[in-house]
């Protein structure tokens, strides 16, 4: 059995960012499981004093696109589109620095999901990064267009 599937997003937790677009899942049953865990994580985030407004504005859509990545339509095999590395780094090192430290020491917040590792993402100018998912972090836009 091949691994990796493209299927329409059927959830609620990330619907405002993803709609019903086609997302990549490693296995057929994974979407429901991750949906439950993202819902639980968002509930915990909503009641947490650990999350600043400047972080949550971009961390929540970023987490949705990480958990339910769009399928790469240019690929002949099912393949996820990645987050953009420059935005990932600004999120981790600037906007959400404190929150990332907290999340790293409390991995059960995300349950089945690993925290995004920016080092896993292709360098911004590489061909592999051309199709990355851009959240729209203002500082990253500036960084992206002027470097």
């Amino acid at each position: 059995e091949e691994d990796g599937f493209c299927q329409p997003y059927r959830g609620i937790a990330c619907a405002r960012f993803i709609g019903n677009r086609t997302v990549y899942m490693e296995s057929l049953h994974m979407q429901g499981e991750i949906e439950n865990q993202i819902t639980a994580a968002f509930t915990m985030i909503g009641t947490s004093s650990h999350l600043s407004d400047k972080c949550s504005q971009f961390a929540i859509p970023s987490l949705c696109h990480y958990a339910f990545p769009y399928c790469d339509e240019t690929s002949s095999v099912p393949k996820p589109r990645d987050l953009c590395r420059d935005e990932c780094e600004i999120l981790e090192n600037v906007l959400c620095q404190t929150e990332y430290i907290f999340a790293r020491s409390n991995p059960m917040i995300l349950m089945r999901l690993k925290l995004p590792n920016c080092e896993d993402l292709p360098q911004p100018e590489s061909p592999e990064a051309a199709n990355c998912i851009r959240i729209g972090i203002p500082m990253a836009d500036h960084h992206h267009h002027h470097h």
């Epitope: 059995e1 091949e2 691994d3 990796g4 990549y24 490693e26 994974m30 991750i34 990480y66 958990a67 095999v77 099912p78 393949k79 996820p80 990645d82 590395r85 790293r104 020491s105 409390n106 991995p107 059960m108 349950m111 089945r112 999901l113 690993k114 590792n117 080092e119 896993d120 993402l121 292709p122 360098q123 592999e128």
Partner: antibody, heavy 120, light 110 residues
């Protein structure tokens, strides 16, 4: 079907070099980490290192750092372990295994292993 | 040098329950170490059983369960079957490197 197949093992003299390959099929390696794990005859498992083929980021065990290099060719869906300055204690069966970049799960698929013997 | 410790060997009767543990020389094992458990039978490649303390890999029987117990990671087998006789390894994550334990030889007798 998901499969990992190692090749390139054999007999090599101390100080010599060898390159192992790990050919993946049934999945795209860019969505995963590819680990190398070795097992000396009659001994336990030892983690060697891993690569994130998507970015080329690599991490190594202290015992092999500076001598071993992990790389990947995403167009061939294959990872490699380049072993230089080989020592007798590097004699082992070398396995490659995959690990999800996104999800918490154990290394879920392993190759059958390839034997590397370092001896004069 | 970080050391991950396991019981060298354990014996259990068929149908019984046994718990294997995995400790770290750096202190208490937490979920942040993402404890992994693997099974290896003679002449075979290892097989992933559990990741992230408690998440079963597809195909892992429900009689296997993972937890944290007294500052260690634990693998519990309930209703042990003869085919569970094998070497069991744990592995812990230390920010960008994995360290395997020495393994526990589980013998099923009876």
């Amino acid at each position: 079907e998901v499969q990992l197949v190692e090749s390139g093992g054999g007999l090599v003299q101390p100080g010599g070099s060898l390159r192992l390959s790990c050919a993946a099929s049934g999945f795209n390696i860019t969505g995963y980490y590819i680990h190398w794990v070795r097992q000396a005859p009659g001994k336990g498992l030892e983690w060697v290192g891993y690569i994130s083929p998507n970015s080329g980021s690599t991490y190594y065990a202290d015992s092999v750092k500076g001598r071993f290099t992990i790389s990947a060719d995403t167009s061939k869906n294959t990872a490699y372990l380049q072993m230089n300055s080989l020592r007798a204690e590097d004699t082992a069966v070398y396995y490659c295994a995959r690990d999800s970049r996104r999800y918490v799960r154990p290394f879920d698929y392993w190759g059958q292993g390839t034997l590397v013997t370092v001896s004069s | 040098q970080t050391v991950v410790t396991q019981e060298p060997s354990l014996t259990v009767s068929p149908g019984g329950t046994v718990t294997l543990t995995c400790g770290s020389s750096t202190g208490a094992v937490t979920s942040g170490y993402y404890p992994n458990w693997f099974q290896q039978k003679p002449g075979q490649a290892p097989r992933g059983l559990i990741g992230g303390t408690k998440f079963l890999a597809p195909g892992t029987p429900a009689r296997f369960s993972g937890s944290l117990l007294g500052g260690k990671a634990a693998l519990t087998l309930s209703g042990v079957q003869p085919e569970d006789e094998a070497e069991y390894y744990c592995a812990l994550w230390y920010s960008n490197r994995w360290v395997f334990g020495g393994g526990t030889q589980l013998t099923v007798t009876g």
